[in-house]
Amino acid sequence: MKVLQEPTCVSDYMSISTCEWKMNGPTNCSTELRLLYQLVFLLSEAHTCIPENNGGAGCVCHLLMDDVVSADNYTLDLWAGQQLLWKGSFKPSEHVKPRAPGNLTVHTNVSDTLLLTWSNPYPPDNYLYNHLTYAVNIWSENDPADFRIYNVTYLEPSLRIAASTLKSGISYRARVRAWAQCYNTTWSEWSPSTKWHNSYREPFEQH
């Protein structure tokens, strides 16, 4: 039994890191393998992650971690029984994929303005709480070409747009994702989408 693709890990910079790897053949990850991990810190202890299958030869492990800080470094040991298959390390702050925003809501009752709000996925004590920026994707269910991205570079989890920038009388969907420039993170997954019917009063034409 050998590791074909070494484990690569990403952290949500809160409490979970996800490591994925591939073996050189079909493997029952949960019965044959264990991933041991330990924070390099005087008061830490070793933990064991039981991997799950992720395709025939692929394995994935969800590591429960202490609250992450920038200096953290974890040692990782992948075992098959008594055999050490791979040894490595992982700095969560260098491989961050933020959590997806939640509770995306479209408020349509604000005088021909659409107000989109969502929740920051981090608690206020987390470093990323004040460092997330967002991208909002709005698209028409009727017209695949009607697809737009709004970059929200301020900290407030909201976006205002004029209803008139979208077509009236048709349904739209929106979703939002996050990233943090300070740690050069990847983008989060998209939030679940929300749907609304866009309608607004056309301004009277002046002749």
Partner: antibody, heavy 115, light 109 residues
Framework: EVQLVQSGGGLVHPGGSLRLSCAGS????????MFWVRQAPGKGLEWVSG???????SYADSVKGRFTISRDNAKNSLYLQMNSLRAEDMAVYYC?????????WGQGTLVTVSS | EIVLTQSPGTLSLSPGERATLSCRAS???????LAWYQQKPGQAPRLLIF???SRATGIPDRFSGSGSGTDFTLTISRLEPEDFAVYYC??????????FGQGTKVEIK
């Protein structure tokens, strides 16, 4: 908002015992290492003890064998049991949250050791 | 034991002036594990800088940290009235694992 609220200080005779408490809120207590740091009157800061999320502990040589740090994650609380107290243990004791550094501190509680 | 020596012991300056505080370690310290705190009379310390140069949440940008190895510096670019306090450096490393410098008092001239 992160808060650490301390209780349990007071006056004790040399050789006596005291238990300090620290209640945490505004963060996930169980995922954070916790510490005690003290400051003798007019002096600087001195690390006393720390406890990891899994219960691993460490002590300064000056308190080893006399002080015991513990935590109750269900109650979001940190404790310091101080036995065989000496005059040199008199200080303001702070609980703190952190790891390599201390992000948040309690308000401090004064321990006076005097006959 | 790593000993942190702060200098000067007291710094007498006027508001608006620049303050430069030094922290020297008896052995090399990883910059990832060097922090600075501010303490005012009757108050708990407050984290200013971690990882030698990263500002903690809510700390004004007039505070900056630098250095590596055995020499670290805290700089306050323009002293505000509320900055007059005692400043401590702190390291995490060898036994005992967490040690503080003896402090530098920044007082009004």
């Amino acid at each position: 908002e992160v808060q650490l609220v301390q209780s349990g200080g007071g006056l004790v005779h040399p050789g006596g015992s005291l238990r300090l408490s620290c209640a945490g809120s505004g963060f996930t207590f169980s995922r954070n290492a916790m510490f005690w740091v003290r400051q003798a009157p007019g002096k600087g800061l001195e690390w006393v003890s720390g406890i990891g999320t899994g219960g691993a502990t460490s002590y300064a040589d000056s308190v080893k064998g006399r002080f015991t740090i513990s935590r109750d994650n269900a109650k979001n609380s940190l404790y310091l049991q101080m036995n065989s107290l000496r005059a040199e243990d008199m200080a303001v004791y702070y609980c703190a949250r952190g790891r390599y550094w201390y992000n948040n501190w309690g308000q401090g509680t004064l321990v006076t050791v005097s006959s | 034991e790593i000993v942190l020596t702060q200098s000067p012991g007291t710094l007498s300056l006027s508001p608006g002036e620049r303050a430069t505080l030094s922290c020297r370690a008896s052995q090399s310290v990883s910059s990832s594990y060097l922090a600075w705190y501010q303490q005012k009379p009757g108050q708990a310390p407050r984290l200013l800088i971690f990882g030698a140069s990263s500002r903690a949440t809510g700390i004004p940008d007039r505070f900056s940290g630098s250095g590596s190895g055995t020499d670290f510096t805290l700089t306050i670019s323009r002293l505000e009235p509320e900055d007059f306090a005692v400043y401590y450096c702190q390291q995490y490393g060898s036994s005992p694992p967490w040690t503080f410098g003896q402090g530098t008092k920044v007082e009004i001239k």
